[in-house]
């Protein structure tokens, strides 16, 4: 048993038929010694008396809010949550496996630049009686500070008969050094509680591996005289790290016809302009990627040819 926060405790249970469970001793937080009784949740049934209560926790019926009273007055509460381990593996019932980039990916994180700021998100079909809290650090044995805001509900989607909820959190490394080579990964830990079930989820990554630039900005076309060619120009996104001479991007320029079946013409360049042939009803799109490290491409920025 361990304390998640004040008066909230997690009991770790091996979950199999006829498992013996865990013996837990609860202590009433009071200077009183006599006349103390214990109840669970809203029940008025007295479970025991005295300053301590010993219980055998085997199932969710044994979890909940234990309250000690004296003469009708509430003295203190202890909320017991269960963390299930089945066949040596902690349960992951609350969050949805996003399966990207691999199976058992419950948390996904992205950074727009090397400032040490990043966003993580997760999905669930559960909405009621649900709590998420997030902690983060760089390294785990001698952790360096990363500050995360409170998690937020960031999207609701209907998926068939189910509603899917996306939650996200923004974090910032306290003493980020954008130009430094990372040697210790960032660790993100999400505590999830649904009703009386506790689970925790972790993700470990280097900022360089989760970089995804914003799309190029100010995408413009300039027709070239007496030619079907156009000069496409764009700028680095505002959110990208500076100086651009050091934090350089490479770009992919694509000409795409109206029909998805039409052949796409692609040009790769380190410059912020390119010359391409603009076909009727086509559109021109540009995306960006870190020039020196193959992390994710940005989303496309697009303009019509006409």
């Amino acid at each position: 048993i361990w304390e998640l926060k004040k008066d909230v405790y997690v009991v770790e249970l091996d979950w199999y038929p006829d498992a013996p469970g865990e013996m837990v001793v609860l202590t009433c937080d009071t200077p009183e010694e006599d006349g103390i009784t214990w109840t669970l949740d809203q029940s008025s049934e007295v479970l025991g008396s005295g300053k301590t209560l010993t219980i055998q926790v085997k199932e969710f019926g044994d979890a909940g809010q234990y309250t000690c009273h004296k003469g009708g007055e509430v003295l203190s509460h202890s909320l017991l949550l269960l963390h299930k381990k089945e066949d040596g593996i902690w349960s992951t019932d609350i969050l949805k496996d996003q399966k990207e980039p691999k199976n058992k990916t419950f948390l996904r994180c992205e950074a727009k630049n090397y400032s040490g700021r990043f966003t993580c998100w997760w999905l669930t079909t559960i909405s009621t009686d649900l709590t998420f809290s997030v902690k983060s650090s760089r390294g785990s044995s001698d952790p360096q500070g990363v500050t995360c805001g409170a998690a937020t509900l960031s999207a609701e989607r209907v998926r068939g008969d189910n509603k899917e909820y996306e939650y996200s959190v923004e974090c910032q490394e306290d003493s980020a050094c954008p130009a430094a080579e990372e040697s210790l990964p960032i660790e993100v830990m999400v505590d999830a509680v649904h009703k009386l079930k506790y689970e925790n989820y972790t993700s470990s990554f280097f900022i360089r591996d989760i970089i995804k630039p914003d799309p190029p900005k100010n995408l413009q076309l300039k027709p070239l005289k007496n030619s079907r060619q156009v000069e496409v120009s764009w700028e680095y996104p505002d959110t990208w790290s500076t100086p651009h001479s050091y934090f350089s991007l490479t770009f992919c320029v694509q000409v795409q016809g109206k029909s998805k079946r039409e052949k796409k013409d692609r040009v790769f360049t380190d410059k912020t302009s390119a010359t391409v042939i603009c076909r009727k009803n086509a559109s021109i799109s540009v995306r960006a990627q870190d020039r020196y490290y193959s992390s994710s491409w940005s989303e496309w920025a697009s303009v019509p040819c006409s």
Epitope: D129, L130, T131, F132, S133, G149, A150, T152, E156
Partner: nanobody
């Protein structure tokens, strides 16, 4: 730390509206997710609604969805609960609460106000 003071409760007829306010003191208000919770006599405290620190997507208990609206004004350090089409079963003490977590559970809020009584008569 954040201190919370609710106001706006009262006695109304079924079908009427009320607007609760919660004034927060402390510069950190804008970093907390805020919630409204309620407790009817002899019942457990129950979750009503929550709004995130960035005033993003609010979330409501099914029992109040479509009738209640939670909002916040970070410039005024205030969170609101607009309650329309009130029913007798909405009678309770309403609490404003703050959390560093996202929670649709009454159990995981860190800071609580003293509460304001809402009574809906039929």
């Amino acid at each position: 730390e954040v201190q919370l003071v609710e106001s706006g409760g009262g006695l109304v007829q079924a079908g009427a509206s009320l607007r609760l306010s919660c004034a927060a003191s402390g510069r950190t208000f804008r970093s907390y997710n805020m919630g409204w919770l309620r407790q009817a006599p002899g019942k457990e405290r129950e979750f009503v609604a929550t709004i995130s620190w960035n005033a993003g997507i609010p979330y409501y208990a099914d029992s109040v969805k479509g009738r209640f609206t939670i909002s916040r004004d970070n410039a005024k350090n205030t969170v609101y609960l607009q309650m329309n089409s009130l029913k007798p079963e909405d009678t309770a003490v309403y609490y404003c609460a703050a959390s560093n977590s996202w929670s649709s559970s009454a159990r995981f809020y860190d800071y609580w106000g003293q509460g304001t009584q809402v009574t809906v008569s039929s």
